[in-house]
Interface confidence: low
Amino acid sequence: AGVFELQIHSFGPGPGPGAPRSPCSARLPCRLFFRVCLKPGLSEEAAESPCALGAALSARGPVYTEQPGAPAPDLPLPDGLLQVPFRDAWPGTFSFIIETWREELGDQIGGPAWSLLARVAGRRRLAAGGPWARDIQRAGAWELRFSYRARCEPPAVGTACTRLCRPRSAPSRCGPGLRPCAPLEDECEAPLVCRAGCSPEHGFCEQPGECRCLEGWTGPLCTVPVSTSSCLSPRGPSSATTGCLVPGPGPCDGNPCANGGSCSETPRSFECTCPRGFYGLRCEVSGVTCADGPCFNGGLCVGGADPDSAYICHCPPGFQGSNCEKRVDRCSLQPCRNGGLCLDLGHALRCRCRAGFAGPRCEHDLDDCAGRACANGGTCVEGGGAHRCSCALGFGGRDCRERADPCAARPCAHGGRCYAHFSGLVCACAPGYMGARCEFPVHPDGASALPAAPPGLRPGDPQRYL
């Protein structure tokens, strides 16, 4: 277990031309806050994939009002670090996304409005317990300067903050100085590597190389039994010389920590190490509540049904995710009918309709034939947003006003000759061909070569020929 810490140093215009305008104005004061999302490994994951290592929101920065037209300076930042606790081992390689959000504090209906100013991402290698690493990332005309590190939470140590566990030796609780290994409450932390020869049954250590004795045992390796009359310490592990303790109720007995918190004894009382999302003396309070404004993009925050349950964000149309942080590609659902062009404007969806169609989703087919007549006995056909005339034989053109030459398209195949006729056209076929358009060759035995039947069909099933 441990904590990834991110310190934002500055957010402002990057070097070079095209400095961005200030995101705040006298009419619309605003303040910044940041969101960090961590994922294990060096994966090229999409921004919407889950923050498997964890995520955190910063506090809101100071309210900032820019004079109209002034260039954007480095903007005032929130206090403190962004901290992402991790329960398991630190992976060593990770991907990050850092988002800069603007909270507009004008008189919006329904409270502040949030908008994403910049998003930077990267992939890094980092050992836990190392020094702060500094970084500069650019997003468009903005530049973000920050430092980050991963540190282990005691008693975890090492570059991965790994914790070794072993089955409990006693049913009720772990040995002195050893915490339960949450969430495996039936296991205890393995002690660190103790002094060589330190009794595995009667000794333990809190620092590498030491050997401290459990109750009733003494000696440099905790191999010598002692009588309880020599105990000096009223409770807890004693020094290696006296080596015993008088059992008594401990402050962690019965685990006073709620919501999966793990308890450790302190000189005066106890301390709860709380899982992500909870804090307070006994981990009794959810760490993020609706008061912290966790729902982005105008999402409505609703507290859980009981004091220990988490908040829920009800997202407005176009957004999803536990914090309404993900924009839905609503156009991917192809909501515009009849070939309309979909435009996702963020606050709304628009369809740009093709000619002949109308309505929010281009669902209405305009009556193309209304008021239009097709000449010479032609009939009007609607479709595709424009009217079309199906003309009577011998006529053509948009409105069937042109006398058609039926032979103009050279409809007779294989050198057949075309003759215009009052009922249409007639093809006089060249030798060896037959059919209305001279399309079939005549075999020497007089049989015509009809199209082949598709696999699985009987040749004598002509209505199903393709």
């Epitope: 904590v3 403190g80 804090y279 609706c290 008061a291 912290d292």
Partner: antibody
Framework: EVQLVESGGGLVKPGGSLKLSCAAS????????MSWVRQTPEKRLEWVAA????????YYPDTVKDRFTISRDNAKNTLYLQMSSLRSEDTALYYC?????????????WGQGTSVTVSS | DIVMSQSPSSLAVSVGEKVTMSCKSS????????????LAWYQQKPGQSPKLLIY???TRESGVPDRFTGSGSGTDFTLTISSVKAEDLAVYYC????????FGAGTKLELK
């Protein structure tokens, strides 16, 4: 400018009830947790009740639990404290206060207070 | 509940003097997951409501003069006024917001 104006205080007999109101202006009321804090005649400050931004969670110390109820109307930008079974030790100046964000933040703005006297 | 103890209860000072006052909590106010101390300092002048000076034990509220400094961690905290001015005469309260909310009894700053 952030303003918090309390009202509803007065003289009440032991066992009686009183409802305090706090009208908020100058900020987005629905974004902040709020508390009631009282100041005794001996000038001690005692926290009385807190409520999160959407009114979904209330917090009380044991001294007032089951007697006091905090609520809010975000549409009216108003915080309330319903006090019942009042005792003489509830006599105090009652302030409403805004937390800097959620409940687990310090209180950055306070009203001028409304006086409650419980006496027979 | 966490008990907050302030000392001294009153302090007589001269203008320009440096002043320190102490606040102790009955248990640690340091939350390990974010390394923040859940402690605030307030100033209350006669006839006025309390005013936030310091939060997270050492972060100065905007508009608060830099002669006010909060320090400490865990259970022991200090408010220092580097050079007292006449307008600083007031009662100073510490408050924890680690679990529920409790205040100290206050330290009254008076003129000698």
């Amino acid at each position: 400018e952030v303003q918090l104006v309390e009202s509803g205080g007065g003289l009440v007999k032991p066992g009686g009830s009183l409802k305090l109101s706090c009208a908020a202006s100058g900020f987005t009321f629905s974004s902040y947790a709020m508390s009631w804090v009282r100041q005794t005649p001996e000038k001690r400050l005692e926290w009385v009740a807190a409520i999160n931004s959407n009114g979904g969670r209330n917090y009380y110390p044991d001294t007032v639990k089951d007697r006091f109820t905090i609520s809010r109307d975000n549409a009216k930008n108003t915080l309330y404290l319903q006090m019942s079974s009042l005792r003489s030790e509830d006599t105090a100046l009652y302030y409403c206060a805004r937390h800097r964000g959620g409940y687990y933040y310090a209180m950055d703005y306070w009203g001028q207070g409304t006086s409650v006297t419980v006496s027979s | 509940d966490i008990v907050m103890s302030q000392s001294p209860s009153s302090l007589a000072v001269s203008v320009g003097e440096k002043v320190t006052m102490s606040c102790k909590s009955s248990q640690s106010l340091l939350y390990s997951s974010n390394q923040k101390n859940y402690l605030a300092w307030y100033q209350q002048k006669p006839g006025q409501s309390p005013k936030l000076l310091i939060y997270w034990a050492s972060t100065r509220e905007s508009g608060v003069p830099d002669r006010f400094t909060g320090s400490g961690s865990g259970t022991d905290f200090t408010l220092t006024i580097s050079s007292v001015k006449a307008e600083d005469l007031a009662v100073y309260y510490c408050q924890q917001y680690y679990t529920y909310l409790t205040f100290g009894a206050g330290t009254k700053l008076e003129l000698k």
